[in-house]
Structure formats: structure tokens, C-alpha cells
């Protein structure tokens, strides 16, 4: 789009005729204040359009905007548009007119707002005053807009002097209405409730001085309403809360409650949902799975943790060997239930450096007036092995034999193996596992008892050698869930003097 | 005319209990947050406890908690407030006071004189 | 709690001077998005109750004179009385309604001098 004269902004003299012409690649139009003005358009042969404004007979009121646009022009871009002031000094024009609405401004959030008071002659100086006030605010003035700012709620006038006559313009009225984007949150006392008791919601909006609630709840569909309360809040400005309070609540009033709030200004509006339900009676009901064994290891602390839903909040107890067991005084024992969301609980029983005695079985037991849930467990102590014991002897028969004994918990596994060049075993010499026949004719005969009090395992294994030739390195290796532990002893031939 | 008129103040042992009311007329009762505010002889004012409007929730000053109940009846238009384990130090006299929602106390009443003392 | 100072206790000023009272809140009574100051100035006379002045910090009550303005921030406020006159010789408190608990200055007495 061209514009001849360019501008931005011309000052034309009162009474004269002044013609304003706008080109471009398709059909243009003059405009001003959003009307089409009386202009002539054509089109050259080189498929350019232009529009010829001619304004005749200037008065003070021709100051203000003009456009140009593309004809018909939908989602202008903003070279789609050129704009031009025009001034035309008129001293008997004083303030320009507005419209009725524009003396009226209605904040709806701290921002800069224009008080468009405008003069015909951008030589003009304006001042800006309380309407009741004679002292000019130190406010910059923008002779094409007007006063902008931050305001006050108060009445102001603008003046000027045109040759030796104070002109005041009409007074202009800044009213602040708290307004903002609506944020809704709903929530309830309790999202789950047995029939007979009560349902209460609150929706709460802060930041806005008008807002309207409407509820959508089940009981309202079949035609049963329910009068929500409106309470203004005065721990802190704007902030309001509808309630929704529904006695003895039916098994139909479960289902999806919605607050929606609107404020009118603006025309902003959100909505939340809740969800609510109403049960027959309690329950309670186990979440997950827990084995019916557990392990624990020995001086080492454990948790053990049971994960429940219930309505209303039950009793939690836990027992070990039919005993009730408590926070025990010492510390060994600690016991918690949490309320991790309304109706999830988690309750955890903590051995603090288990001792084998804690080994035994446990039960859960969670319970109310209505329902009742338990959950048991055996408790097993883990116990890392350790090899108490390995002894190398040679008896008459000529074979050689070495004993292995360890402990532990669960039951260990023996691993026998043996290295035959000490110098490069065993971090070049990978051990040869012995015991299951191998080439060095070696028999193995492991034996098993479990001790009750301990609650351990005991193994004692002897591996027999039938002939050494030569010295040779024997581990042995004792492995559980918990652990492993391990023995070396070196054997020598009957032939060789031990060094 | 907006009118707030404050009784059952008077003389009252230590420990014991009052119950002051407040009448309100000349406006719509429930549009309005209500508050007590007290002032003890040849002292500054102290605000107590207030009301809100149509859902009547209460707040009170850290001094009273526990102590004072106010509370309305919307039907009869009466403002209370309910004082117990009354202390020498809650001697004053006992305003009455409407605000708008979010609004500076805009209408009192003339007050009633309420003496704690053995 | 919100904390108001007054300042100063008490004051003497000569018919037709200035009065100036000063009162500072603890924490900001300013409301961001529409720039309300949730603070107002009362006047009291013996044995009467407060009168509200100035409310939103700098509106004037309907009726009362113009020689009273207030002004100031979000925690720094002022009272003016321009021209005292004999009428005017009262205790005036600052109060904060932004939240509870509302909380009063411990108000300013102002005599002629």
C-alpha cells in the first residue's frame, strides 16, 4: 500500500480542500472511525488500484485517523493497512466530541489507560486535572490519543487554552472493576461418602469482585436442586467460595459435580469437576500384593508395608505371633499409618536393626464399624554366610582331605574349586571348579542341619582328593541370597615337606 | 438511613461471660461483612472479630481466639458476640461496624461499655 | 499480621497550617491488578465513634471537606490536612482491610497549637 502524501500526520489549514490518494495490487478503500468514506477508486492498466479521497471544506472535526486497506480485507496483516493523522487547527473547535461511552472507563486490571481527550492543533498545550482539582498531573500527553497512564478511580477533565479562552474538555470517569481470568478450584470435604451422611463442595474464585457460580450435580438432572450459599471471603481481597451442601446423601447423588463460574465484564469463565461417591456402607480393601514370605536381613533395618483403601478412616493394627505389638520404647520397633490421599492409607512397620528373634509371623489388621481386612506374612531373617571352618588332613588311606563348615541364612551353596600354579592363580589362572568328578578324582559328600534358636543353616562339606601330585590352592566359597564368603587352604603332596 | 445500635455491655467478674448484640437497619444485612471493634479507656482501637456476608464465615483477632463467638441471625438482622473467660484487658467499649466486602468499615455504631473487674 | 505505624503520637499545628500523619504497614495493602491501596483514615472525637475519611488510601468520603487528602504506596501512607481548622482537633487512625485480622494504627491525637 502507498500512501501520497506519506504522512504519518498532516496539518491542513480550516475551510481548505485537501486530496489523499492510496495504491496498491488489489482493490483499496479509505476509511475512518470503521466507516467507508465517499472516495473515487480506479484501476490502471498496469493492474494497480488506487482510491482518491477529497476532503472539501476542512473543519477542526476532520482531525482524527485515516486508513487505507484492501477492499474486503479479513485477519488484516498490518502492512495490509496504512494509517494517517490528519490535524486541522480549528480554534472553534476546543476538545474534539466523544461518544458517551469513552467518558466512561472501566479498568478491569492495573494497566495504562488512555483518556482520549484531543485538539485540533497538535500546538496545543493540554493539561490533565482531577475534575475537582486545579493542579495538572504529571500525566504525558500524546496530541493524536490523549492522556495515558495509570489511573486512579477518580473524575478528570482536560484543559487547554485557545488564543486567551481556557477550554475544559467533558469529564471522564475511570472506574477500577477487579476483574481477571477465572481460576476455578473444587474441591470437597470428602470425595467419598456413605449413604445417610453429608455432601459438601466449595468452588472458590480469588481476583474477581463479580462472579456468578452455577453447580451441575447429579440430583439437579432428576429435577432436585440443591440452593449453593455465596460467602466472601475476607482473609484476602476477592476471594469468594460457593458451598454445596446436599444432607444425607443417597447412592444416586453419586456421579460428576461441576462448578462453573462466569464474570460478565469480560466474558471469562472456567469450570472444575469433581467427582464424589456414595457408598452402601464402608470398606476396606487391600491395593497390591504382598508375599507371604518376607525377608529381612540381620542388623540391618527393614520396612515392611501395606498399602490399603478404606472409608471412613479404620483402625490400624499390627500383631507378630498373635501378640499386639507396639512403637516399642527401645526404638526397635516403629509403626506408622499414613493418610496418603483421602481414602489410601499406608501403614509400615520398621525393625530397626533386626535381630533373629523378629523373625515369626505377622498380620495386618485394618478395621471399622463396617469392614475389616487383614493381611499376614511370615518373616524370615536373612543371615549373610560366613565360613567358620577349613581344615586340610590326611588320613592313613593315602587320600587327602579338606573340610569346609559355614553358616547362614537362607540355606548357603558351596562352591569348591582349586588352582594348580599358585604363582599365576588366581588372577591369570581362571579356579577349576572341583567336586562333580573332575580330573583330579575328587569326591564330595556336603551335609545340612538347620538350627532352630540361630534359625540358620549349617553346612559342612569334605572334599576328598584322591592322589595330589603337586600343590595345589582350594577355596571354598559359600554363597546365599544375602552374601557370599570364602576359604583358601593350600594342599601339598604326602611326598612334599610342607614349607 | 444505615443504623447500628450496640447493647448488653455492663460489669462482669473476671472469668465470667457477655453477650453483646448489635441491631442493624437501613440496609440489606446479608450484602454486608459485619466486625466488632473494640477500644479500651484512652486507647486505639483494636479490631476483634468479623463476619462475612451471606456465607457468615468468622475470623477472629489471635487475643480472642477461642474465647469469642460471633454470630448472626439473618431473619431478626442481630449481630453477637459471645465472650467468655472474659479478662481484666477486655474492658472497652464494644463497636459495632459494617463493611462492603473488601471494604473499610463505612457505618458504626455508638458503642457499649463492657468492665471485666473483680 | 499486617503492622501499622503511626507516626507521629500526637501533633500541634496552628489554625490555617498543614497537619501531616504518616502511617506504615508491615507488609504491602496494595492489590496488583487494579492498584487499590485496601487502606482508609478515620477520624474520632471523644465519645463518639470513628468516622471514615479517606478510604482506597486517597478516596475521599462524600462530605468531607477537601482539605483532607490522603496519599501514598503500597506500605508508606500519609494523611494531609490542609488548613487546620479548630473542628478538626481529633485522634485519626490509619486502618488495613486487605486481610485478616485488620489491623489500626495506634493513631495520632492532633491539637491546635
Known amino acids: 500500500l502507498v500512501i501520497t502524501p506519506p504522512g504519518p500526520e498532516l496539518i491542513l489549514n480550516v475551510s481548505s480542500t485537501f486530496v489523499l490518494t492510496c495504491s496498491g495490487s488489489a482493490p483499496v478503500v479509505w476509511e475512518r472511525m470503521s466507516q467507508e468514506l465517499p472516495q473515487e477508486m480506479a484501476k490502471a492498466q498496469d493492474n494497480t488500484f488506487s482510491s482518491v479521497l477529497t476532503l472539501t471544506n476542512l473543519t477542526g472535526l476532520d482531525t482524527g485517523e485515516y486508513f487505507c486497506t484492501y477492499n474486503d480485507s479479513r485477519g488484516l496483516e498490518p502492512d495490509e493497512r496504512k494509517r494517517l493523522y490528519i490535524f486541522v487547527p480549528d480554534p472553534t473547535v476546543g476538545f474534539l466530541p466523544n461518544d458517551a461511552e469513552e467518558l466512561f472507563i472501566f479498568l478491569t486490571e492495573i494497566t495504562e489507560i488512555t483518556i482520549p481527550c484531543r485538539v485540533t492543533d497538535p500546538q496545543l498545550v493540554v493539561t490533565l486535572h482531577e475534575k475537582k482539582g486545579d493542579i495538572a498531573l504529571p500525566v504525558p500527553y500524546d496530541h493524536q490519543r490523549g492522556f495515558s497512564g495509570i489511573f486512579e478511580d477518580r473524575s478528570y477533565i482536560c484543559k487547554t487554552t485557545i488564543g486567551d479562552r481556557e477550554v475544559d474538555s467533558d469529564a471522564y470517569y475511570v472506574y477500577r472493576l477487579q476483574v481477571s481470568s477465572i481460576n476455578v478450584s473444587v474441591n470437597a470435604v470428602q470425595t467419598v461418602v456413605r449413604q445417610g451422611e453429608n455432601i459438601t463442595l466449595m468452588c472458590i474464585v480469588i481476583g474477581n469482585e463479580v462472579v456468578n457460580f452455577e453447580w451441575m450435580y447429579p440430583r439437579k438432572e432428576s429435577g432436585r436442586l440443591v440452593e449453593p450459599v455465596t460467602d466472601f471471603l475476607l482473609d484476602m481481597p476477592y476471594h469468594i467460595r460457593s458451598i454445596l451442601h446436599i444432607p444425607s446423601a443417597e447412592l444416586e447423588d453419586s456421579g460428576t459435580y461441576t462448578c462453573n463460574v462466569t464474570e460478565s465484564v469480560n466474558d471469562h469463565q472456567d469450570e472444575k469437576a469433581i467427582n464424589i461417591t456414595v457408598v452402601e456402607s464402608g470398606y476396606v480393601r487391600l491395593l497390591g500384593e504382598v508375599g507371604a514370605l518376607q525377608f529381612a536381613e540381620l542388623h540391618r533395618s527393614r520396612t515392611l508395608q501395606v498399602v490399603f483403601e478404606a472409608y471412613p478412616p479404620p483402625t490400624v493394627l499390627w500383631f507378630k505371633d498373635n501378640r499386639t505389638l507396639g512403637d516399642s520404647s527401645a526404638g526397635e520397633i516403629a509403626l506408622s499409618t499414613r493418610n496418603v490421599s483421602e481414602t489410601r492409607y499406608v501403614s509400615e512397620l520398621t525393625l530397626v536393626r533386626v535381630k533373629v528373634a523378629e523373625a515369626g509371623h505377622y498380620t495386618m489388621r485394618a478395621f471399622h464399624e463396617d469392614a475389616e481386612v487383614q493381611l499376614s506374612f511370615q518373616l524370615q531373617i536373612n543371615v549373610p554366610v560366613r565360613v567358620l571352618e577349613l581344615s586340610e588332613s590326611h588320613p592313613d588311606s593315602g587320600e587327602q582331605t579338606v573340610r569346609c563348615r559355614g553358616r547362614g541364612m537362607p540355606q548357603p551353596n558351596i562352591i569348591w574349586s582349586a588352582c594348580r600354579d599358585l604363582k599365576r592363580c588366581p588372577r591369570e589362572l581362571p579356579p577349576m571348579l572341583l567336586g562333580n568328578s573332575s580330573e583330579e578324582e575328587s569326591q564330595l559328600e556336603t551335609n545340612v542341619t538347620y538350627w532352630e534358636e540361630e534359625q540358620e543353616f549349617e553346612v559342612v562339606s569334605t572334599l576328598r582328593l584322591q592322589h595330589v601330585d603337586r600343590p595345589l590352592s582350594v577355596r571354598c566359597t559359600l554363597r546365599n541370597a544375602v552374601g557370599q564368603d570364602m576359604q583358601e587352604v593350600i594342599v601339598v603332596p604326602h611326598s612334599l615337606p610342607f614349607k | 438511613q444505615v443504623q447500628l445500635v450496640e447493647s448488653g455491655g455492663g460489669f462482669v467478674q473476671p472469668g465470667g461471660s457477655l453477650r453483646l448484640s448489635c441491631a442493624a437497619s437501613g440496609f440489606t444485612f446479608t450484602n454486608y461483612a459485619m466486625s466488632w471493634v473494640r477500644q479500651a479507656p484512652g486507647k486505639g482501637l483494636e479490631w476483634v472479630s468479623a463476619i462475612s456476608g451471606v456465607g457468615g464465615s468468622t475470623y477472629y483477632a489471635d487475643s480472642v481466639k477461642g474465647r469469642f463467638t460471633i454470630s448472626r441471625d439473618t431473619s431478626k438482622n442481630m449481630l453477637y458476640l459471645q465472650m467468655n473467660s472474659l479478662r481484666a484487658e477486655d474492658t472497652a467499649v464494644y463497636y459495632c461496624?459494617?463493611?462492603?466486602?473488601?471494604?473499610?468499615?463505612?457505618?458504626w455504631g455508638q458503642g457499649t461499655l463492657v468492665t471485666v473487674s473483680s | 499480621d499486617i503492622q501499622l505505624t503511626q507516626s507521629p503520637d500526637s501533633l500541634a499545628v496552628s489554625l490555617g497550617e498543614r497537619a501531616t500523619i504518616n502511617c506504615k504497614s508491615s507488609q504491602s495493602v496494595l492489590y496488583r491488578s487494579n492498584n487499590k491501596k485496601f487502606l482508609v483514615w478515620y477520624q474520632q472525637k471523644p465519645g463518639q465513634p470513628p468516622k471514615p475519611l479517606i478510604y482506597?488510601?486517597?478516596t475521599r468520603e462524600s462530605g468531607v471537606p477537601d482539605r483532607f487528602s490522603g496519599s501514598g504506596s503500597g506500605t508508606d501512607f500519609t494523611l494531609t490536612i490542609n488548613s487546620l481548622q479548630a473542628e478538626d482537633v481529633a485522634v485519626y487512625y490509619c486502618?488495613?482491610?486487605?486481610?485478616?485480622?485488620?489491623?489500626f494504627g495506634q493513631g495520632t491525637k492532633v491539637e491546635i497549637k
Open positions: 486502618q488495613q482491610y486487605y486481610s485478616t485480622p485488620y489491623t
Open positions: 482506597w488510601a486517597s
Open positions: 461496624a459494617k463493611a462492603p466486602h473488601w471494604g473499610p468499615f463505612g457505618s
